[in-house]
């Protein structure tokens, strides 16, 4: 199977980990979100929107 991390799914230097159950992004310092797309504000808050229906923020996201 092709390496799903080769598509570089994680933004802002996030580390992609692939597994048979999906892939996850370990976000670099200062970023958060399923794909590390959101900056963490200095006060620790974030501009993170609500998770899409049926997806909890920490869940692995399946790849095809």
């Amino acid at each position: 199977r092709a390496d799903p991390c080769a598509a570089r799914p994680c933004a802002h230097g996030g580390r992609c980990y692939a597994h048979f159950s999906g892939l996850v992004c370990a976000c670099a310092p200062g970023y958060m979100g399923a794909r590390c797309e959101f900056p963490v504000h200095p006060d620790g808050a974030s501009a993170l929107p609500a998770a899409p229906p049926g997806l909890r923020p920490g869940d692995p996201q399946r790849y095809l």
């Epitope: 570089r8 799914p9 580390r15 996850v24 310092p29 920490g58 692995p60």
Partner: antibody
Amino acid sequence: QVQLVQSGAEVKKPGSSVKVSCKASGGTLSSYVISWVRQAPGQGLEWMGGIIPIFGTANYAQKFQDRVTITADKSTNTAYMELTSLTSEDTAVYYCARDPFSDLWGRGTMVTVSS
Amino acid sequence: DIVMTQSPLSSPVTLGQPASISCRSSQSLVHSDGNTYLNWLQQRPGQPPRLLIYQISNPFSGVPDRFSGSGAGTDFTLKISRVEAEDVGVYYCMQATQFPHTFGPGTKVEIK
């Protein structure tokens, strides 16, 4: 602010086992690797193994493969490292760290193996 | 396993002078996601390690700007532009591109 809080110091007999815990206080372990690193007195850092809690799969350094088990409990945001068949050579400070960026470290747990 | 080497292993420096530490990996640290997971850690006596630089050259928050990292592929460098007394300790490079993660042997920085 996430912190990694480790269990307290242990004194163990040769041949016994030790289980050290590492709790993410104020946050989640989620998709990071929680690594276990040990440091014998006066020595350098040695990576023992790590787990990605969201997957539940662990990776181990070959040196420790037969003696170490790393687990994680997502419900309590806690990772565990169990080392078996202890000898005096296992006397060390054991750290947990959040990888791949090594941006969070526990304070360390001193494990002393002595008869 | 990827083997990490460092030089020098000991570096006596004069306060206010620069210091440089080299780190080499036995194979490329470029991950399939395009990033290079090479970190620099500082360990002061009696303390846990502390992140200075991640992904070769990104300074961690709160790290003084006298610390900088550079390099690519298999060759990396940590530079301290002007050494201060609080910089005394052991510096480690570490790779997290591939399991098992591995550390360099450490470089001890001391004041002359």
